[in-house]
Interface confidence: medium
């Protein structure tokens, strides 16, 4: 261990003063996994990058601390930095989708990815499939795959077709889908996270 802590510190030290301030404010409202508490506001706002890294690791441990940090960075629009953080903290697994090189590797987290855990619910409840397709197109979906999903007549069948490509995806590819879901149907993701 220790690698995740270093990666968190590296990410936070690369933020501008304004970005670090924004990071702390977002950290105060970001959804947390069940069983985890929130870092007290008073302590949080006065911390520098090093203190904040130590606090994140002590509150959330390294693995979840890194995941949480990456989520907040993504919420701030810093996708590249979030990807680098995750790539630095996890080994890759799974092949890239046909014709497309995988994004920076990040799999090997314990258990199933959110996308796999909630496959049935996502197939049944995602309504804005094409919004997702546009977010994934060129990144994890080839044109052929994109067209195949879009050709399906209903949202559930579109989602089923989309899921037919996910066995070849690594953790980061699945994170891209989760991020797109957060952007298009955040209430659904929050609902499933609570379930």
């Amino acid at each position: 261990m220790g690698r995740a802590r270093d990666a968190i510190l590296d990410a936070l030290e690369n933020l501008t003063a304004e970005e670090l301030k924004k990071f702390k404010l977002k950290l105060l409202s970001v959804p947390l996994r069940e069983g985890y508490g929130r870092i007290p506001r008073g302590a949080l706002l006065s911390m520098d990058a090093l203190d904040l890294t130590d606090k994140l690791v002590s509150f959330y441990l390294e693995t979840y601390g890194a995941e949480l940090t990456a989520n907040v960075l993504r919420d701030m629009g810093l996708q590249e930095m979030a990807g680098q953080l995750q790539a630095a903290t996890h080994q890759g697994s799974g092949a890239a989708p046909a014709g497309i090189q995988a994004p920076p590797q990040s799999a090997a987290k314990p258990g199933l990815h959110f996308i796999d855990q909630h496959r049935a619910a996502l197939i049944a409840r995602v309504t804005n499939v094409e919004w997702l397709l546009d977010a994934l197109y060129g990144k994890v979906l080839t044109d052929e795959q994109y067209q195949a999903v879009r050709a399906e007549p209903t949202n559930p069948s579109k989602m089923r077709k989309l899921f037919s490509f996910t066995p070849a995806w690594n953790w980061t590819c699945k994170d891209l889908l989760l991020q797109a879901l957060r952007e298009s149907q955040s209430y659904l993701v929050e609902d499933l996270e609570r379930s």
């Epitope: 810093l78 497309i100 090189q101 094409e130 977010a135 060129g138 990144k139 044109d143």
Partner: antibody, heavy 118, light 111 residues
Framework: EVQLQQSGAELVRPGSSVKMSCRTS????????ITWVKQRPGQGLEWIGY????????EYNEKFKDKATLTSDTASSTVYMQLNSLTSEDSAIYFC???????????WAQGTTLTVSS | DIVLTQSPASLAVSLGQRATISCRAS??????????MHWYQQKPGQPPKLLIH???NLESGVPARFSGSGSGTDFTLNIHPVEEEDAATYYC?????????FGGGTKLEIK
């Protein structure tokens, strides 16, 4: 502010090749694709192809498959288009543009004028 | 390839009146969710500028006098009321399937 800046005008000989650049700033470079579009003097727009810079994924219009090669350099947030075996038919303005959701082209560079002449 | 046919090729409209430009696709570019048709404005010596994306969504910073409509194969760009600065060539473009293609353009002149 999102900006795309293309390299300057080129005057080249028939049969040669040229490599033009499109430098981007103001957004996360790896999040969007960059498309290239050709416009001959006084004529309409032709879609050449695009590159998703995060992973180098490219798609080409069949018509330009043997003519254009798209590459990118993440470090400098720059996309390149190389055109080979140039003829007078390739004389045109070439635009790069950012590919956004729905694959509309939301930001365009000023264009690079290519003149192929002996 | 999907062929986009714009009409008219040119039109002259009086200041303050309505300009209507049509774009017809050789096959449908719409799904149940979106119509993958976009509209651009190009002035001499300048690159095109995106006005409308996904058939009817106005780009930020584009005046509300521009509007887009249509689905399937038939799409329309309306400008009302037309202003002096709207003199330009307008292009439709689809992104339904590869290759994405543009219409031939409609030149708008202000009388």
């Amino acid at each position: 502010e999102v900006q795309l800046q293309q390299s300057g005008a080129e005057l080249v000989r028939p049969g040669s090749s040229v490599k033009m650049s499109c430098r981007t700033s103001g957004y996360t470079f790896t999040n969007n694709g960059i498309t290239w579009v050709k416009q001959r003097p006084g004529q309409g727009l032709e879609w050449i192809g695009y590159i998703y810079v995060g992973n180098g994924y490219t798609e080409y219009n069949e018509k330009f498959k043997d003519k254009a090669t798209l590459t990118s350099d993440t470090a400098s947030s720059t996309v390149y288009m190389q055109l080979n075996s140039l003829t007078s038919e390739d004389s045109a303005i070439y635009f790069c543009a950012r590919l956004d959701r729905g694959r509309a082209l939301d930001y365009w560079a000023q264009g690079t004028t290519l003149t192929v002449s002996s | 390839d999907i062929v986009l046919t714009q009409s008219p090729a040119s039109l002259a409209v009086s200041l303050g009146q309505r300009a209507t430009i049509s774009c017809r696709a050789s096959k449908s570019v719409s799904s149940s969710a979106y119509s993958y048709m976009h509209w651009y404005q190009q002035k001499p010596g300048q690159p095109p500028k995106l006005l409308i994306h996904l058939a009817s969504n106005l780009e930020s910073g584009v005046p509300a006098r521009f509007s887009g409509s249509g689905s399937g194969t038939d799409f329309t760009l309306n400008i009302h009321p037309v202003e002096e600065e709207d003199a330009a060539t307008y292009y439709c473009q689809h992104s339904w399937e590869l290759p994405y293609t543009f219409g031939g353009g409609t030149k708008l002149e202000i009388k």
